[in-house]
């Protein structure tokens, strides 16, 4: 969470932001918000990134002011209309790139005063894992596939029953580059496992962690996963 | 939920004042707008104010200058709309509604203002 | 200060029917217009915001369009309860302005 005042005439105003990552390919959403004004004519928002020339986004008056928007952003940003009026000035960015990495500013004028806060966005791949039982495997064997990351992560298989046991003796993970270059499928198995347990496969590089939980029993198979975006901490 | 709980009806004599409460609940008091809004009986409706509790910015429509004053304690989540020099043309009911994710998205229940000698 | 004009003043209809209220903006308010319903003794609720999006718990027969100085506020199908006056307002300028009104009343 970034806190950023202006230094405006009358008063400064309060713009928040908040650390956030896009899964390239995806829609991604740069959050930040503003003490309301009452008007919407005198809002104004600002969208800038560091070492870009031109603008992200602009919004005044009521409307998008798209003739100083910088060519990498053409077509792929919006703010939403009906939220401005609330403090809300998030950018919803459209086909997220690598490239989209890096230090933007939100910068809002309103009729009580100017202020601005930067954010960090970080770009890459992650998706959730899936953990099933391979029974094409000469022993008990668990696969672990998530079909996009990127940067390149790790991968650690963890269980219930032996808590703090180290597995990289016994699976094997491989990265299969993706057909646009850039992400990777991961693989990882799981060797010698046993029946009553419960094993967590987790994935994890700088931008996001996954897991993905299976119970093996006799009778049945449960499964979980989930997936946390880690931000970065407030400058 | 959100709720905005106005004082009861009240009856002045011309030339009084009148102080109207509107207590805020369900929702983080200091970072919306509060507003005020009458409707004369069987007329429209007219914006009054409004007040931003966090910092105790008011904009005011430049018809009730002088005759409304709107203030906000923030202990107690209430915004108080003070009207003077009260006239016949001033009886009617008056609303706060605050903007929390839409404008005008709740409203109290409304006060009914009579002024009669 | 922007003058918000409604009309017809007055739309009499029977259950069933499409209702078509219109908003007109002294000026260009983009599409900062909310819409209210309100009935007799109660306070106006909020049916569309932001010229076009409908609040929540509002049923979808209300629709919301417009931008600019031209807002339309469209019933798809009346429903007994929703015999009642409509307002817009603009949140563009300052002072906030309501238009006089559209009561929708029972044919």
């Known amino acids: 969470l970034i806190i950023g005042f202006g230094i405006s005439g009358r008063h400064s105003i309060t713009v928040t932001t908040v650390a956030s990552a896009g899964n390239i390919g995806e829609d991604g959403i740069l959050s930040c918000t503003f003490e309301p004004d009452i008007k919407l004519s005198d809002i104004v928002i600002q969208w800038l990134k560091e070492g870009v020339l031109g603008l992200v986004h602009e919004f005044k008056e009521g409307k998008d002011e798209l003739s100083e928007q910088d060519e990498m952003f053409r077509g792929r940003t919006a703010v939403f209309a009906d939220q401005v009026i609330v403090g809300n000035a998030s950018l919803r960015l459209k086909n997220v790139q690598l490239t989209d990495a890096g230090t933007y500013k939100c910068y809002i004028i309103t009729s009580k005063g100017k202020g601005n806060a930067n954010l960090e966005y970080k770009t890459g791949a992650f998706s959730m894992p899936e953990v099933n039982v391979d029974y094409n495997a000469s022993s008990e064997t668990l696969r672990c596939e998530a079909p996009r990351w990127f940067p390149q992560p790790t991968v650690v298989w963890a269980s219930q029953v032996d808590q703090g046991a180290n597995f990289s003796e016994v699976s094997n993970t491989s990265f299969e580059l993706n057909s646009e270059n850039v992400t990777m499928k991961v693989v990882s198995v799981l060797y010698n496992v046993t029946i009553n347990n419960t094993y967590s496969c987790m994935i994890e590089n700088d931008i996001a962690k996954a897991t993905g939980d299976i119970k093996v029993t006799e009778s049945e198979i449960k499964r979980r996963s989930h997936l946390q975006l880690l931000n970065s901490k407030a400058s | 939920q959100v709720q905005l709980v106005q004082s009861g009806a009240e009856v002045k004599k011309p030339g009084a004042s009148v102080k109207v409460s509107c207590k805020a609940s369900g929702y983080t008091f200091t970072s919306y707008w509060m507003h005020w809004v009458r409707q004369a009986p069987g007329q429209g409706l007219e914006w009054i104010a409004a007040i931003y509790p966090g910092n105790s910015d008011t904009d005011y429509n430049q018809k009730f200058k002088g005759k409304a004053k709107i203030t906000a304690v923030t202990s107690t989540s209430t915004v108080y709309m003070e009207l003077s020099s009260l006239r016949s043309e001033d009886t009617a009911v008056y609303y706060c509604?605050?903007?929390?994710?839409?404008?005008?998205?709740?409203w109290g229940q409304g006060t009914m203002v009579t002024v009669s000698s | 200060e922007i003058v918000m004009t409604q009309s017809p003043a007055t739309l009499s209809l029977s259950p069933g029917e499409r209702a078509t209220l219109t908003c007109k903006a002294s000026?260009?308010?983009?599409?900062?217009v909310a819409w209210y319903q309100q009935k007799p003794g109660q306070a106006p609720k909020l049916l569309i915001s932001s010229a076009s999006y409908r609040y929540t718990g509002v049923p979808d027969r209300f629709s919301g369009s417009g931008s600019g100085t031209d807002f339309t506020l469209t019933i798809s199908s009346l429903e007994p309860e929703d015999f009642a006056v409509y307002y817009c307002q603009q949140h563009y300028n300052t002072p906030l302005t309501f238009g006089g009104g559209t009561k929708v009343e029972i044919k």
């Open positions: 509604t605050t903007t929390v994710a839409h404008y005008f998205d709740y």
């Open positions: 000026q260009d308010v983009s599409f900062a």
